[in-house]
């Protein structure tokens, strides 16, 4: 469930603190409820960037697990089509810490509406 997703995000946050990853990531910091799935897709795609840049097994595994969890949760809700949402590349670029904080916020949005 989404609680496990948050715990994976916290784990990623802890793991990257011990590394120097200065990437900036497309971050949706003000998610509109009607675009939350699109925003989630962008967060997950950017997580893969963190995984790739870190070259770390623990981060890789945790990112992969998080994507598997999110996929399964969202697929159980059926196909959700959203329109008029920002493309990932249109989002503001932020550092990893801010990116992960915003990611936690969107997950909490899913928790609150489930």
């Amino acid at each position: 469930n989404w609680v496990n997703v948050i715990s994976d995000l916290k784990k990623i946050e802890d793991l990257i603190q011990s590394m120097h990853i200065d990437a900036t990531l497309y971050t949706e910091s003000d998610v509109h409820p009607s675009c939350k799935v699109t925003a989630m897709k962008c967060f997950l795609l950017e997580l893969q960037v963190i995984s790739h840049e870190s070259g770390d097994t623990d981060i890789h595994d945790t990112v992969e697990n998080l994507i598997i969890l999110a996929n399964n949760i969202l697929s159980s809700n059926g196909n959700i089509t959203e329109s008029g949402c920002k493309e990932c590349e249109e989002l503001e670029e932020k550092n990893i810490k801010e990116f992960l904080q915003s990611f936690v916020h969107i997950v909490q949005m899913f928790i609150n509406t489930s």
Partner: antibody
Framework: EVRLMASGGGLVQPGGSLRLSCAAS????????MSWVRQAPGKGLEWVAT????????YYPDSVKGRFTISRDNSKNTLYLQMNSLRAEDTAVYYC???????????????WGQGTLVTVSS | DVVMTQSPLSLPVTLGQPASISCRSS???????????LEWYQQRPGQSPRLLIY???NRFSGVPDRFSGSGSGTDFTLKISRVEAEDVGVYYC?????????FGQGTKLEIK
Amino acid sequence: EVRLMASGGGLVQPGGSLRLSCAASEFTFSNYAMSWVRQAPGKGLEWVATISRGGDYTYYPDSVKGRFTISRDNSKNTLYLQMNSLRAEDTAVYYCARRVSMITGGWAMDYWGQGTLVTVSS
Amino acid sequence: DVVMTQSPLSLPVTLGQPASISCRSSQSIVDITGNTYLEWYQQRPGQSPRLLIYKVFNRFSGVPDRFSGSGSGTDFTLKISRVEAEDVGVYYCFQESFVPYTFGQGTKLEIK
């Protein structure tokens, strides 16, 4: 050439336990997730379990969840499948397979071992 | 769970002729990141399965170019442009987009 050698199969009574092993060589074992897939006699393939590269994350179908445990020892380049509370329907050839992970270009089981036969019968 | 349904289950083909196997999923297997983890495996008689195609249309290394994969959403196809004797066996589609990962029932290709 990537090599995967499954072993540990045999005859076991219903309710019994068995541990399968899969010895990996000719590749960096810790860089790959791994899976077990089984095939009942004359039947199709069924995914049984997957484990992440570091071993922290495991995935199972409901048919084996709570009875089977996938694990790995990266220092020994070995994958395991602990099977408890075995049933007649668990009778199958069990294959281990290397799993290419998504972040390196897509999920797929790119190399398979030769399989080991597990027979559950009284 | 995603159910994968293959057709036909048996496919007699003349050597040198094309062959086509269909695989349909019970729901879209496009994941949240836009990827479709649909694979095709070949199992020759008495052998372990072998990866042919991954992510719908990507041929695995060493797989002859007479094998091709296509499709999207819920409908997928494996095509063999000209069947050779070594192609005899059972072909399985497999989705790895959602847990539990699931195989199709298999299609047995035989020479007429």
